[in-house]
């Protein structure tokens, strides 16, 4: 999916206003120097699409993060913000949250996360940049 | 059942505030957006704007910029629109409708009833 | 953005096959298939017919469905009902600023 007609304002609001928080709370007890950041983004359409991948795609060490309150709260505000965020798009990440059900807080989870926040940051960094 | 309970008529003076609420029931309240749509007399729907619970995010039609404000309260599943600076022309029924699901908030899947205010000097 | 163009009314005998077109720009109906339409009675609230241009949801007849080409969008009414009488508004995404615009509305009248 091209995220390059979302409004980018209003998704870094969503961001700093709820999002952010709710993956903080994920990582609590663990330190920020806990994990290396592996992924990066360029520019804003790109740092959606990592987000988009790292939050919805599920991993082998790491299948629960779509139920997560950031997650759900992540696809709101691309929904809400990207015009041509696909029902598809939606309706797939919806039939994977189904199919999970233990909800396990690994070491991998944990790294994903921190992996989310780091693009998350980079993508409020990019924004800057444009302004 | 799902359903959508609107507070009653209101009559208004022009230039005063009103405030019509909206209660939630039968469905998971963060899971979707509210809608106000309202209706004038012998005319069409037109959109005024949206909260989305989970986000804690409102969007305004331009048209009511600045005069419209939409809240939620959480405990008790209600929605609550407040227009304000009334002139007669706002005169119409004004209803509460729910979003679709899945984070399909473009269409409108369950509507109140509806709420007449009547702004008359 | 201004509101899709409606038909005023248009009108059918009983068993017919009525079509209500729904005409907006390339920034609305013609950028997304984001169109619903909706079914009104006299003094009563809208109900959801059809979304995302061609999607039935539950309990709505099959008799009723909707299509899309360029700029436009059709609501198709076939074997038409005396409670089909009603007011019918599309309406279509229309990006995050606007967001939802509403047709003005074709008043069906069964003769």
């Known amino acids: 999916y091209d995220f390059t007609n979302c409004d980018f304002q209003k998704i870094e609001a969503d961001y700093l206003r709820t999002i952010s928080k709710d993956l903080i709370t994920y990582m609590s007890g663990t330190k920020s120097t806990d994990f290396n950041n592996t992924v990066s983004c360029s520019n804003r359409p790109h740092c959606l699409t990592e987000i988009q991948s790292l939050t919805f795609n599920p991993t082998p060490r790491c299948a629960s993060l779509a139920k997560e309150m950031f997650a759900r709260k992540t696809k709101a505000t691309l929904a809400l913000w990207c015009p041509g965020y696909s029902e598809t798009q939606i309706n797939a990440t919806q039939a994977m949250k189904k199919a999970r059900k233990s909800k396990v807080t690994t070491n991998k989870c944990l790294e994903q996360v921190s992996q989310l926040l780091g693009l998350w940051r980079r993508f409020i960094r990019t924004l800057l940049k444009k302004q | 059942q799902e359903q959508l309970v609107q507070s009653g008529d209101e009559v208004k003076k022009p230039g005063a505030s009103v405030k019509v609420s909206c209660k939630s029931s039968g469905f998971t309240f963060g899971s979707y957006a509210i809608s106000w749509v309202r209706q004038a007399p012998g005319q069409g729907l037109e959109w005024m704007g949206m909260?989305?619970?989970?986000?804690?995010?409102?969007n305004y039609a331009e048209k009511f910029q600045g005069r419209v404000t939409i809240t939620a309260d959480p405990s008790t599943t209600t929605t609550s629109m407040e227009l304000s600076s009334l002139r007669s022309e706002d005169t119409a029924v004004y209803y509460c409708a729910r979003g679709g699901s899945n984070y399909l908030y473009w269409y409108f899947d369950l509507w109140g009833p509806g709420t007449p205010i009547t702004v008359s000097s | 953005q201004s509101a899709p163009i409606q038909p005023r009314s248009v009108s059918g005998s009983p068993g017919q096959s009525v079509t209500i077109s729904c005409t907006g720009t390339?920034?609305?109906?013609?950028?997304?298939?984001?169109i619903s339409w909706y079914q009104q009675h006299p003094g009563k609230a809208p109900k959801l017919m059809i979304y995302d241009v061609s999607k039935r949801p539950s309990g709505v007849s099959d008799r009723f469905s909707g299509s899309k080409s360029g700029n436009t969008a059709s609501l198709t009414i076939s074997g038409l009902q005396a409670e089909d009488e009603a007011d019918y508004y599309c309406s279509s995404y229309a990006g995050t600023d606007t967001f939802v615009l509403f047709g003005g509305g074709t008043q069906l009248t069964i003769v």
């Open positions: 390339s920034s609305d109906i013609g950028g997304y298939n984001r």
């Open positions: 909260l989305v619970p989970l986000l804690g995010v409102t």
